[in-house]
């Protein structure tokens, strides 16, 4: 959890989703005219996001408490979860409408379908997460969150297919962290780096969070991490809550979320 954009929330809220991202001027919030907002997006190879694109991003977790220009001179911002200081207690796109005065100063919402993205909120029964650009080396200064939320009663079986991150003794530079919860605070399982494949992990509940961070220097090959659903009736979910059994790590039951 952390204080950001005027509200207290956890890292489920994505910084970028479905090609949509938020930009502000170097001088800070609400400094861009419509023409400047357009320029910001275009200089990065994108364009101002449409209302539909912003809403599509919001639906998969894009949440920013700052009004910004969209295509056609519209202004608004995406709210996933209402908060007292943001969005008037509503969810959805808080829409200020099409502005007649294009010299008003707001932030910008850009859309770039080619932007390298990572992370998201996932409810599929199985999926493979890859470091950005895999199988090519990942870039410096990456931060990605993958939040898995399955049906109540289901569990998550995580396995590492490829793994090659910069190695340092404390995994302080580049690392993957796994949390047996829906945020990056509770249920810490472990931090991983180097090129040894970590053992499989099975969650205690129906949610899990993976965080990938790379620093500003050395990069490496990256990773592929697969998850599959373990249904309540399946044999592996009945295993004892021991720290490790074979090549699987079972976590003592703590976190479950509807």
């Amino acid at each position: 959890w952390g204080f950001k954009n005027g509200i207290f929330h956890n890292s489920i809220w994505l910084e970028q989703a479905a090609g949509v991202y938020h930009r502000e001027a170097r001088a800070g919030r609400y400094k861009l005219t419509y023409a400047e907002a357009k320029a910001v997006c275009e200089f990065e190879g994108g364009r101002l996001a449409t209302y539909k694109q912003l809403e599509a991003a919001r639906k998969i977790g894009f949440h920013v408490c700052a009004a910004g220009w969209m295509a056609k001179g519209r202004v608004g911002y995406p709210i996933v979860k209402p908060g007292p200081n943001c969005g008037f207690g509503k969810t959805g796109i808080i829409d200020y409408g099409i502005r007649l005065n294009r010299s008003e100063r707001w932030d910008a919402y850009c859309y770039n379908p080619h932007a390298k993205e990572c992370g998201g909120v996932f409810t599929d029964p199985k999926r493979i997460f890859k470091s950005p650009g895999f199988p090519n080396e990942y870039d410096d200064n990456q931060v990605c969150y993958w939040h898995i939320r399955l049906k109540y009663g289901q569990r998550i079986h995580l396995s590492f297919l490829d793994f090659d991150l910069e190695h340092d003794p404390g995994c302080l530079a580049d690392y993957v962290e796994i949390y047996d919860s829906y945020d990056d605070v509770h249920g810490f399982v472990g931090r991983y780096c180097g090129d040894e494949l970590p053992e499989d992990i099975i969650s205690t509940g129906n949610v899990m969070t993976l965080k990938f961070l790379s620093d500003a220097s050395v990069t490496a090959g990256g990773f592929q991490i697969k998850y599959v659903t373990v249904d309540p009736a399946s044999k592996s979910s009945q295993a004892k809550n021991t720290s490790t059994t074979g090549n699987k790590k079972f976590l003592p039951g703590r976190f479950s979320h509807l």
Epitope: E36, A39, G45, K116, N141, S217
Partner: antibody
Framework: QVRLQQSGAELAKPGASVKLSCKAS????????MHWVKQRPGQGLEWIGY????????KNKQNFKDKATLTADKSSSTAYMQLSNLTYEDSAVYSC?????????????WGQGTTLTVSS | ENVLTQSPAIMSASPGEKVTMTCSAS?????MHWYQQKSSTSPKLWIY???KLASGVPGRFSGSGSGNSYSLTISSMEAEDVATYYC?????????FGSGTKLEIK
């Protein structure tokens, strides 16, 4: 400290191509954008275009679209500009300069410049 | 293209004299930046975001302006200030420089 080291002077014939380099050190190459600027003798400065090394995205000024090709090699922290189909008007000093990608843009560090002479 | 017109093209000032040069933009911009270039060297960032002095720039320099009109001022001219000064806008495509003001000493 930040340093942008450019390749040495070039002498080329009309119609030929040259590839100028700009090696960055003292900072994280992929965290900044690299721009190229042209200056003809006794004249002002003209922006050519830029590359975002992290993504490879480039944007050139319209009149340099067919003239300048910008590339970057992340492994060696080097930006390149290839100038093709050279004419006498391409004789100039070409400088690389970095910006931090925050808007509005400015160049905080410059290379020392590469002198290109086009002569038959 | 946003054309930046600098005036005067050439000026000279005595040591200790106040110097002001201007930059006029054909389209309004929120910020202007300034570069100093001495002969046979690369330009140096001198003033950014209209009024912020780059690292190592003496306090006698200042920048101001808004919209279409910006200026660079030296409160008290010194010999080391002899150079050409270029204004620059990084707000719109294509990025553009002014034609420069050459500052000489009397």
């Amino acid at each position: 400290q930040v340093r942008l080291q450019q390749s040495g002077a070039e002498l080329a014939k009309p119609g030929a191509s040259v590839k100028l380099s700009c090696k960055a050190s003292g900072y994280t190459f992929t965290s900044y954008w690299m721009h190229w600027v042209k200056q003809r003798p006794g004249q002002g400065l003209e922006w050519i275009g830029y590359i975002i090394p992290s993504s490879g995205y480039t944007k050139n000024k319209q009149n340099f679209k067919d003239k300048a090709t910008l590339t970057a090699d992340k492994s060696s922290s080097t930006a390149y500009m290839q100038l093709s189909n050279l004419t006498y008007e391409d004789s100039a000093v070409y400088s690389c300069a970095r910006s931090d990608g925050s808007y509005p843009y400015y160049f905080d560090y410059w290379g020392q410049g590469t002198t290109l002479t086009v002569s038959s | 293209e946003n054309v930046l017109t600098q005036s005067p093209a050439i000026m000279s000032a005595s040591p200790g004299e106040k110097v002001t040069m201007t930059c006029s933009a054909s389209s309004s911009v929120s910020y202007m930046h300034w570069y100093q270039q001495k002969s046979s060297t690369s330009p140096k960032l001198w003033i950014y975001d209209t009024s912020k002095l780059a690292s190592g720039v003496p306090g006698r320099f200042s920048g101001s302006g808004s919209g279409n009109s910006y200026s660079l001022t030296i409160s008290s001219m010194e010999a080391e200030d002899v150079a050409t000064y270029y204004c620059f806008q990084g707000s719109g495509y294509p990025l553009t420089f002014g034609s420069g003001t050459k500052l000489e000493i009397k």
